[in-house]
């Protein structure tokens, strides 16, 4: 996981400035108010593999 | 590097009382919901109290099998988490861990502490 | 309560075999999006070591022999190669709800 300056976040993460490393997007649905959020509704989710 | 260090556990008496710490350190630890989980023979793993963060006020959780009996809290200046079990049964003997989640899995886990409740 | 049920209780493997783990919810745990259970390694005299996330997605430093599946109700765990190392027992975690609930464990040793 490295800062946005360097490479993006991996699919289905987005940068997090207050925790200063990428997060899930999918803890958005427990905690939608989290930083890193506004980056992961611009951004596809990880698809499933079933 | 992440560690999470627990304190408290020992022998106590059916309808006793216990307090354990758990001391965090390499994470930004006001950010991070604070459980408790333990673990039994007979139980399995199981999770039992929750705390979350100061900007909501610090909303707590519960399992059914401890509400009214455990209450956890935490300081966040000091990197802590406890949970104050009173009224204590024998089926609470078990191993207790404290464990990080940001919303969902458990990435980060304690070295657990025993609870032994008999007389 | 969200109940997990996995199959088998436990499970004896070849070296260089595969283990196959079940995890099944009482109800389903996914979104159009993500899927809330999550795999943990638990070894003797030792708290549970957290393996993978939504369902597929490994932590970092979890080799990629370890692997994840499934939406729904229905989860798998699939450890192949498996090692020696591997000999432990794994559990599945919902987060879908409060309260967040294990299953009761799968044993895996090895031949």
């Known amino acids: 996981e490295q800062a946005p300056g360097n490479a993006p976040c991996s699919r289905g993460s987005s940068w997090s400035a207050d925790l200063d490393k990428c997060m899930d997007c999918a803890s958005c649905r427990a905690r939608p108010h989290s930083d890193f959020c506004l980056g992961c509704a611009a951004a596809p989710p990880a698809p499933f593999r079933l | 590097e992440v560690k999470l260090q627990q304190s408290g556990g020992g022998l106590v008496q059916p309808g006793g009382s216990m307090k354990l710490s758990c001391v965090a350190s390499g994470f930004t630890f006001s950010y991070y919901w604070m459980n408790w989980v333990r673990q039994s023979p007979e139980q399995g793993l199981e999770w039992i109290a929750e705390?979350?963060?100061?900007?909501?006020?610090?909303?707590?959780h519960y399992a059914e099998s401890v509400k009214g009996r455990f209450t956890i809290s935490r300081d966040d200046s000091k990197n802590s988490v406890y949970l104050q079990m009173n009224n204590l049964r024998p089926e609470d003997t078990g191993i207790y861990y404290c464990a990080c989640r940001y919303a969902d899995y458990f990435d980060h886990w304690g070295q657990g502490t025993t609870l032994t409740v008999s007389s | 309560d969200t109940v997990l049920t996995q199959s088998p209780a436990s499970l004896v493997v070849s070296l260089g075999q595969r283990a196959t783990i079940s995890c099944r919810a009482s109800q389903s745990v996914s979104t159009s999006d993500y899927s809330y259970i999550h795999w943990y390694q638990q070894k003797p005299g030792q708290p549970p070591k957290f393996l993978i996330k939504y369902a597929s997605n490994r932590d970092s430093g979890v080799p990629a022999r370890f692997s994840g599946s499934g939406s729904g109700t229905d989860f798998t765990l699939n450890i192949h190669p498996v090692e020696e190392d591997d000999t432990a027992i794994y559990y599945c975690?919902?987060?879908?709800?409060?309260?967040?609930?294990f299953g009761a464990g799968t044993k895996l040793e090895l031949q």
């Open positions: 975690q919902h987060s879908w709800e409060i309260p967040p609930t």
């Open positions: 705390i979350r963060l100061q900007s909501n006020d610090y909303p707590t």
